[in-house]
């Protein structure tokens, strides 16, 4: 009689993640008399998948009815397939014995489980950077297999391509992630900008999985300042502007100084927002000329989103026919927390002079 | 390793019924077919039936079919054969014997229940 | 039903020597290359135990002087040099349908 064959027919097979996977085995043989069981890998670490002789297995079913006659097919079915069940597995044939005797192996079948990546996480710098600086976003995917795996970074549809992307680990594993840093230059724009993080892999059949960070959470965009001069009113008061402009985020507060002191203290709150996210808010000082004997200098300070404040200067002539002067001051840190009223208007898109 | 073992010794009347128990051990109870035979005494062995205990198909020999059944519980793993309208002749060994290669043969048995038929 | 005829139904052979027994049957027990006949042995007061399985294969742990051969409807047992443990009852069986017992011989030592 020829030799016994354990026939594994497939070299590899490919399951999805929760699905079943059949083992396909037959003997070529009903000599000799013995059972056949089921290995994940070789040698003596190898591991029990199956013994139609004896044991439980309950994720595993045998495909043919064991009991049947003269039964030569010992394939098997693996219900619930995870990227853990990834392997080489052998079909073994024993010789019936006290204990049984292993006799021959098939030739292995590679199980490699199709495991989808986890939704894309993006996150974005832990504090806000200015307008015209870089920042890093990062973004995770877990639990995808097989290895290959694509990511891309948009900006507003734009792919990124300052970008570093690893999958770990290196070697094999049972599944993998993916890690992806993308530097961003921010511009005064980006407040309603949007990045995209987006994963294709095998197991998405081309509808990849994306996700998003908004620029928002991650930009201060800082104000322009102009202070001016109304004309002389009847009552020689002097209406004197500050408009605060083209600002993100809403949290700023702006201080009057006259002649160095504090004049009022305003905090910004519910202001309308610009077509491109970011605020204005105007702030005006009334001046009673009479009341001075000298040159008034005004002082609209602002201090925006915790950064230091910015200071835009204006004096008010005290003289028959006034004559409007601004002039820049170096930053002073001079603001107070003392609230004072706080009126505004939108005065959006005019040319103004930029002070940091 | 396989293991069969029988419910003792039987004396019955004429008209009777015994029920024979085996239970099964080291190895997949539900995996292998179980046959029963019976050898009276100084006689050859006769093939009474066989039963899957994963599905309670049986075969039988035409000779008992009408007074013979064959059952399993599984959460036990223990085949019984019963047997009715017991006559004189009936007296024998009963054997359990477990299919091991799936062909109809009798791999390992277990040690025998005497059966007594005597009025 | 096929029916199983063993031949001779006692025999004595010496020690040493070769003990052939034989087991016909009415009809072929052959099917897609496999012969359906097994040999049993049965010592006095214990269940038979299995010898030979498929007309020529030895169930494990047989002594090698046990062999069988065969096909179609005749088959012959032969122990190659009889040793005294091989006093026994030997029986054959066929499963090619139902399964069925030969009426079993005798061998003793001479």
């Known amino acids: 009689e020829e030799e016994l064959q354990v026939i594994q027919p497939e070299k590899s097979v490919s399951v999805a993640a929760g699905d079943s996977a059949t083992l396909n085995c037959t003997v070529s043989s009903l000599i000799p008399v013995g059972p056949i069981q089921w290995f994940r890998g070789a040698g003596p670490g190898r591991e029990l998948i199956y013994n139609l002789k004896e044991g439980h297995f309950p994720r595993v079913t045998a495909v043919s009815d064991p009991t049947k006659r003269n039964n030569m097919d010992f394939s098997i079915r693996i219900s619930n397939i995870t990227p853990a069940d990834a392997g080489t597995y052998y079909c073994v044939k024993f010789r019936k014995g006290s204990p049984d005797v292993e006799l021959k192996s098939g030739a292995g079948t590679e199980l490699s489980v199709r495991a989808k990546p986890s939704a894309p996480v993006v996150s974005g710098p832990a504090v806000r950077a200015t307008a015209e600086h870089t920042v890093s976003f990062t973004c995770e995917s877990h639990g995808f297999s097989p290895r290959d795996i694509t990511l891309k970074w948009f900006k507003n549809g734009n792919e990124l391509s300052d970008v570093q992307t690893n999958v770990d680990p290196a070697g094999k594993s049972v599944s993998y992630s993916i890690r992806s840093t993308a530097r961003v230059l921010l511009t005064r724009r980006d407040v309603h900008s949007q990045v995209i993080c987006e994963v294709a892999h095998v197991t998405l059949q081309g509808d990849p999985l994306r996700g998003t960070a908004n620029l928002s959470e991650a930009i201060r965009v800082p104000p322009f300042l102009e202070v001016t001069q109304q004309s002389m009113r009847a009552d020689n008061q002097v209406n004197v502007t500050c408009q605060v402009t083209k600002f993100y985020p809403q949290r700023l507060q702006l201080t009057w100084l006259e002649n160095g002191n504090v004049s009022r203290t305003e905090m910004a709150s519910a202001l309308p927002e610009n077509k491109d996210g970011t605020y204005n808010w105007t702030s005006w000082l009334l001046v009673n000329v009479s009341a001075h004997r000298d040159d008034v200098k005004l002082t609209c300070q602002v201090e925006h989103d915790g950064q230091p404040a910015v200071n835009k200067s204006f004096s008010v002539k005290v003289s028959a026919h006034p004559k409007e002067q601004g002039s820049n001051t170096a930053a002073e840190n001079t603001g107070t927390n003392e609230r004072g009223s706080s009126d505004y208007k939108d005065d959006d898109d005019k040319h103004h002079h930029h002070h940091h | 390793q396989v293991q069969l073992v029988q419910s003792g010794a039987e004396v019955k009347k004429p008209g009777a019924s015994v029920k024979v128990s085996c239970k099964a051990s080291?190895?997949?109870?539900?995996?292998?077919?179980i046959n029963w035979v019976r050898q009276a005494p100084g006689q050859g062995l006769e093939w009474i039936a066989m039963i899957d205990p994963s599905d309670s198909e049986t075969h039988y020999n035409q000779i008992f079919k009408d007074r013979a059944t064959l059952t399993t519980d599984t959460s036990t793993s223990t085949a019984y054969m019963e047997l009715r309208s017991l006559r004189s002749d009936d007296t024998a060994v009963y054997y359990c014997?477990?299919?091991?290669?799936?062909?109809?043969?009798?791999?390992?048995w277990g040690r025998g229940t005497l059966v007594t038929v005597s009025s | 039903d096929i029916v199983l005829t063993q031949s001779p139904d006692s025999l004595a052979v010496s020690l040493g020597e070769r003990a052939t027994i034989n087991c016909r049957a009415s009809k072929s027990v052959s099917s897609s290359g496999y012969n359906y006949i097994f040999w049993y042995q049965q010592k006095p007061g214990q269940p038979p135990k299995l010898l030979i399985y498929l007309a020529s294969n030895l169930d494990s742990g047989v002594p090698d002087r046990f062999s069988g051969s065969g096909s179609g409807t005749d088959f012959t047992l032969t122990i190659s040099s009889l040793q005294a443990e091989d006093v026994a009852v030997y029986y054959c069986q066929h499963s090619r349908e139902l399964p069925t017992f030969g009426q079993g011989t005798k061998l003793e030592i001479k």
């Open positions: 080291g190895y997949t109870f539900t995996n292998y077919w």
């Open positions: 014997a477990m299919d091991y290669g799936s062909l109809y043969a009798m791999d390992y």
